[in-house]
Interface confidence: low
C-alpha cells in the first residue's frame, strides 16, 4: 500500500540502488518514486553531516522485504517511495531553495530580475533541468541577477553547496507548465540520429515515448519494431538527445518508429505508467513471484499491489492452468523494462500500474506545494484541489469554493446551498486558475447529489459542511487532483504553514477576483478565537485563522474553499472556509469548519453512497 510517513533522525542501512544529490527530502522521495527499484530512501541535509561529500546526499534503496533496518542519525530523513500512491505521484517540484547552489553543467547565463523569472526561463528551455539565481545582494557584483540554466547526466545536481544570496530550483516542465509545446506526432519508418542516452526494451513505441518523457535527458527516441531486420535489436527503444534539442538528421528506415518526449507539453503530460495489456507476448525478467489467478486483469492488479513488481506475464499454456486460474508471473528488472520480449506465445503481458496517477481512490495527496483579502495571485497547478462552484440561472456566476477530495467528491460549506439546494443549477469547474478562461465550451461537472450535514441549520455557524457527489468521476492531472484529508480528531499536529485560497472578494465591499488568490494565514487557538467572538460559540469543531492586525483573510466568495496546511511535505485539508465578522478586520479571525472533526461523517457518506470508501485520511 501507500506509505507516506517520514522518519526523522533515521537512516536506512543497506539496500542501496542509487545515490544522488537533492536539495531536500521531498525531492529525494520523488526520485525514489520514479526509480524502478527504489522502495525506500534516506536523505542527509547539510546540517546532519560534516562530510561535505555526503551533504544533501539522497540514497535510494531497495529491499526484498519492503523494509530495511533504521539506524539513528541526527538530522537524517528517511521514508518510502510513493509508488502505489496514485495522485500523489508527480515529477513536478516547484520549491525554490534559498542559500543553496545546485551545481551542474552551466549552459546558459542571462540577467533576470527575479528567481521566478529564472525558473520560467529554465522551464521554457528544452535542455534546462535546474537553475541557480544570484540575488541582488550576492557578494560579487558582476554575478548579481545572473540566471544560470543547468543540466546534468542524471537530471539531478552534480553537487549542492550552501552559498549565501543564491537561490536554486528545478524546471517546471514536469508540472506541464512549459511554453515550448510538444510534438505529438509518431513518425513511422524513420530513425533519428544523435546521442543515445539509454536503451530499453519496450513492446511498442508508445511505451518508449512515455519512458522518454520521464527520462531526465531524453528529448526524442527511435523504436525498432518486432519485425526489425536484426533480431537482437527488435523492440529496442533508443532514448536520444542532441546539443540543439532536436534530431540533427533522420533516416528513412523500414520497421522503425521515432518521436519526441512529451515533457514540454503544456497543460497535459502522459501518466508515468503503461496500462495496455499485450496479448500473445511474454515479458522476461527476474522472477519475483508466481501466482494462480483468474484472468489477465487480475494478474495486472496482483502485480500492481506487489510493490516490487514491474511487469508480468499471464500464461495460458495448458500446463500453467488449473481450472479457471492460470499462472501469473510477476517480474522485475534493473531498469523497470522487460529484459526479453517474445511474440507469438500463449501469454499476455503488461506493466504494473503502481505509478499511475489515477491509482486507488482511497489515498490522499502530498504533492503540491486564497478573494482573499491581502492575498497574491496563484499559479497553475499550485492548488489543484480548488474548485469553483458556480450557479447558472439567467446568468452564470461564481458563488463558492470547494475542495476535490476524490474522483467524484467535492467538500464544501453547507451554507453555499442556502436557498439554492437544486443540484441542476450548479456547475463545478476544476483545474482552472482564471475565471475569465471559462467559456461556454469549458468542461464542467454536474452534481449527482448534495449531502448537507444533518445538524446544519441555515444562518447558524455550526456543522457548516457539505459533500457534493459529481455525476461523473474526474481524471487526475497536475492541475486537478485531490487534497488529503486529516486524521480523525487530529489535535496533536501543530500546523505552522497554512494557506487559504479562493476567488472571493478582495475587500468587504468588493467583487469576485479573476485569478485564484492565495494567502498565508496563521492558525489561532480556539480560546483566543472565542475572545474575539464573544457573541458566538466557537466549538471544538471549528478552527480559526488570522492575523491579530487583520489585513489578510478569506472573504465573500471564498466560502466552502480550503484552508490547507503543509506538514512533513504533505498538504492536508484542515478547514473549510465558513464565516467571520467582515473580512480581514483587526482581531477578527476567519472561522473554518474543522475537517478532522467530521472524518467519520465524510467516510460514512462517501462509503454509503456507493458502497466503497472513496477517500481516506493518512495513516
Amino acid at each position: 500500500g501507500c506509505l507516506t510517513q517520514l522518519y526523522e533522525n533515521a537512516f536506512f542501512r543497506g539496500g542501496d540502488v542509487a545515490s544522488m544529490y537533492t536539495p531536500n527530502a521531498q525531492y529525494c522521495q520523488m526520485r525514489c518514486t520514479f526509480h524502478p527499484r527504489c522502495l525506500l530512501f534516506s536523505f542527509l541535509p547539510a546540517s546532519s553531516i560534516n562530510d561535505m561529500e555526503k551533504r544533501f546526499g539522497c540514497f535510494l534503496k531497495d529491499s526484498v522485504t519492503g523494509t530495511l533496518p533504521k539506524v539513528h542519525r541526527t538530522g537524517a530523513v528517511s521514508g518510502h517511495s510513493l509508488k502505489q500512491c496514485g495522485h500523489q505521484i508527480s515529477a513536478c517540484h516547484r520549491d525554490i531553495y534559498k542559500g543553496v547552489d545546485m551545481r551542474g553543467v552551466n549552459f546558459n547565463v542571462s540577467k533576470v530580475s527575479s528567481v521566478e523569472e529564472c525558473q520560467k526561463r529554465c522551464t521554457s528551455n528544452i535542455r534546462c533541468q535546474f537553475f541557480s539565481y544570484a540575488t541582488q545582494t550576492f557578494h560579487k557584483a558582476e554575478y548579481r541577477n545572473n540566471c544560470l540554466l543547468k543540466y546534468s547526466p542524471g537530471g539531478t545536481p552534480t553537487a549542492i553547496k550552501v552559498l549565501s544570496n543564491v537561490e536554486s530550483g528545478f524546471s517546471l516542465k514536469p508540472c506541464a507548465l512549459s511554453e515550448i509545446g510538444c510534438h505529438m506526432n509518431i513518425f513511422q519508418h524513420l530513425a533519428f540520429s544523435d546521442v543515445d542516452v539509454a536503451r530499453v526494451l519496450t513492446p511498442d513505441a508508445f511505451v518508449c515515448r512515455t519512458i522518454c518523457t520521464y527520462h531526465p535527458n531524453c528529448l526524442f527516441f527511435t523504436f525498432y519494431t518486432n519485425v526489425w531486420k536484426i533480431e537482437s535489436q527488435r523492440n529496442v527503444c533508443l532514448l536520444k538527445t542532441s546539443e540543439s534539442g532536436t534530431p540533427s538528421s533522420s533516416t528513412p528506415q523500414e520497421n522503425t518508429i521515432s518521436g519526441y518526449s512529451l515533457l514540454t507539453c503544456k497543460r497535459t503530460l502522459p501518466e508515468p505508467c503503461h496500462s495496455k495489456i499485450y496479448p500473445g507476448v511474454d515479458f522476461g525478467g527476474e522472477e519475483l513471484n508466481v501466482t494462480f489467478v483468474k484472468g489477465v486483469n487480475v494478474c495486472q492488479e496482483t502485480c500492481t499491489k506487489m510493490i516490487r513488481c514491474q511487469f508480468f506475464t499471464y500464461s495460458l499454456l495448458p500446463e500453467d492452468c488449473k481450472e479457471e486460474k492460470c499462472k501469473c508471473f510477476l517480474r522485475l528488472s534493473m531498469d523497470g523494462s522487460p529484459t526479453r520480449i517474445a511474440y507469438g506465445t500463449q501469454g499476455s503481458s503488461g506493466y504494473s500500474l503502481r505509478l499511475c496517477n489515477t491509482g486507488d481512490n482511497s489515498v490522499c495527496t502530498t504533492k503540491t506545494s486564497t478573494r482573499i483579502v491581502g492575498g497574491t495571485n496563484s499559479s497553475w497547478g499550485e492548488w489543484p484541489w480548488q474548485v469553483s462552484l458556480q450557479v447558472k440561472l439567467t446568468a452564470q456566476r461564481h458563488l463558492c469554493g470547494g475542495s476535490l477530495i476524490g474522483h467524484q467528491w467535492v467538500l464544501t460549506a453547507a451554507h453555499c446551498f442556502d436557498g439554492l439546494p437544486l443540484q441542476d443549477v450548479w456547475r463545478i469547474y476544476s483545474g482552472i486558475l482564471n475565471l475569465s478562461d471559462i467559456t461556454k465550451d469549458t468542461p464542467f461537472s454536474q452534481i449527482k447529489e448534495i449531502i448537507i450535514h444533518q445538524n446544519y441549520k441555515v444562518s447558524e455557524g455550526n456543522h457548516d459542511i457539505a459533500l457534493i457527489k459529481l455525476q461523473a468521476p474526474l481524471n487526475y492531472t497536475e492541475f486537478q487532483k485531490p487534497i488529503c484529508l486529516p486524521s480523525k480528531g487530529d489535535t496533536s499536529t501543530i500546523y505552522t504553514n497554512c494557506w487559504v485560497t479562493g476567488w472571493g472578494f478582495s475587500k468587504e465591499k468588493g467583487e469576485i477576483q479573476n485569478i485564484l488568490q492565495k494567502v498565508n494565514i496563521p492558525l489561532v487557538t480556539n480560546e483566543e478565537c472565542q475572545k474575539r467572538y464573544q457573541d458566538y460559540k466557537i466549538t471544538q469543531r471549528m478552527v480559526c485563522a488570522g492575523y491579530k492586525e487583520g489585513g489578510k483573510d478569506a472573504c465573500k466568495g471564498d466560502s466552502g474553499g480550503p484552508l490547507v496546511c503543509k506538514h512533513n511535505g504533505m498538504w492536508r485539508l484542515v478547514g473549510i472556509t465558513s464565516w467571520g465578522e467582515g473580512c480581514a478586520r483587526r482581531e477578527q479571525p476567519g472561522v473554518y469548519t474543522k475537517v478532522a472533526e467530521y472524518m467519520d461523517w465524510i467516510l460514512e457518506k462517501t462509503q454509503s453512497s456507493d458502497g466503497k470508501a472513496q477517500m481516506q485520511s493518512p495513516a
Epitope: S232, G285, E286, S333, R340, T345
Partner: antibody
Framework: EVQLLESGGGLVQPGGSLRLSCAAS????????MHWVRQAPGKGLEWVSS????????LYADSVKGRFTISRDNSKNTLYLQMNSLRAEDTAMYYC?????????????WGQGTLVTVSS | DIQMTQSPSSLSASIGDRVTISCRAS??????LNWYQQHAGKAPKLLIR???SLETGVPPRFSGSGSGTDFTLTISSLQSDDFATYYC?????????FGQGTKLEIK
C-alpha cells in the same frame, strides 16, 4: 581483442571461502552485464550469477544464493565472485563470461576458467 | 524455472554427415535461445544467438532454427573440428538455463 582472465581458484576445505577474480580487457567493461558459469567435472554448464553494468543489480542461482556474492569494479575492469560456506558440490571449473548488448542473456565471450576444488 | 532438454545426449557421426541436435524448452521462449560449442578441456564458445543468428567467424555450415519451445542446431557437413559438446541455453529468463549437452563423437 576481448580477453577474460580468471584467477583465485584452488583447493579449499568444506565450509571455507575463496574469492575469484576476472580481469577484462578489449571492450568497455562498464557497459556489459557479466556472468559466472561453472562446470563440475564431467558435467554440463550451470549458470551461477550475473551482475548488471552499474553493479546495482545482481542475480544468483538458487544453489548458491546466500553463500556467493558477485561484484564488479568498473574502474579496474574486474569482476569478482566471493564464495563462502563452500560445499563439495561447488567443485567445478568456474568461467567468467561477458553478456550481450543490452545486458543480453547470450554469453559472447568466455574466459579459460579457474578450477575450484572443495575437499577435506 | 524453464527446463531445457536436449536430444540426443550423445551422437556418433562421420565427417561430411548432416547432423541435427534438438533442444526443447518447457515453456515458450520466443527466439531467446543460444547455442554453444565446447571442446574437451576448453571454454565454451557462442555459435548462434537468438535461435538463428550466426556469430561472426562461425562457419556457415552451422545453422539454427525454431521458436517457442522447439529449436534445432544443424551442421550441414561435419568437419573434424566439429566433434565437441553442444549446449543450448535460454536467455528469456534471467536464470540462463542450459540444456544438459549433446556430445558429438566421431564414428
Amino acid at each position: 581483442e576481448v580477453q577474460l582472465l580468471e584467477s583465485g581458484g584452488g583447493l579449499v576445505q568444506p565450509g571455507g571461502s575463496l574469492r575469484l577474480s576476472c580481469a577484462a580487457s578489449g571492450f568497455t567493461f562498464s557497459q556489459y552485464a557479466m556472468h559466472w558459469v561453472r562446470q563440475a567435472p564431467g558435467k554440463g554448464l550451470e549458470w551461477v550469477s550475473s551482475i548488471y553494468p552499474s553493479g546495482g543489480f545482481t542475480l544468483y542461482a538458487d544453489s548458491v544464493k546466500g553463500r556467493f556474492t558477485i561484484s564488479r569494479d568498473n574502474s579496474k575492469n574486474t569482476l569478482y565472485l566471493q564464495m563462502n560456506s563452500l560445499r563439495a558440490e561447488d567443485t567445478a571449473m568456474y568461467y567468467c563470461a561477458r553478456g550481450g548488448w543490452l545486458a543480453g542473456g547470450e554469453l559472447l565471450n568466455w574466459g579459460q576458467g579457474t578450477l575450484v576444488t572443495v575437499s577435506s | 524455472d524453464i527446463q531445457m532438454t536436449q536430444s540426443p545426449s550423445s551422437l556418433s557421426a562421420s565427417i561430411g554427415d548432416r547432423v541435427t541436435i534438438s533442444c526443447r524448452a518447457s515453456r515458450g521462449i520466443g527466439t531467446y535461445l543460444n547455442w554453444y560449442q565446447q571442446h574437451a578441456g576448453k571454454a565454451p564458445k557462442l555459435l548462434i544467438r537468438a535461435a538463428s543468428s550466426l556469430e561472426t567467424g562461425v562457419p556457415p555450415r552451422f545453422s539454427g532454427s525454431g521458436s517457442g519451445t522447439d529449436f534445432t542446431l544443424t551442421i550441414s557437413s561435419l568437419q573434424s573440428d566439429d566433434f565437441a559438446t553442444y549446449y543450448c541455453q535460454e536467455s528469456f529468463t534471467n536464470v540462463y538455463n542450459f540444456g544438459q549437452g549433446t556430445k558429438l563423437e566421431i564414428k
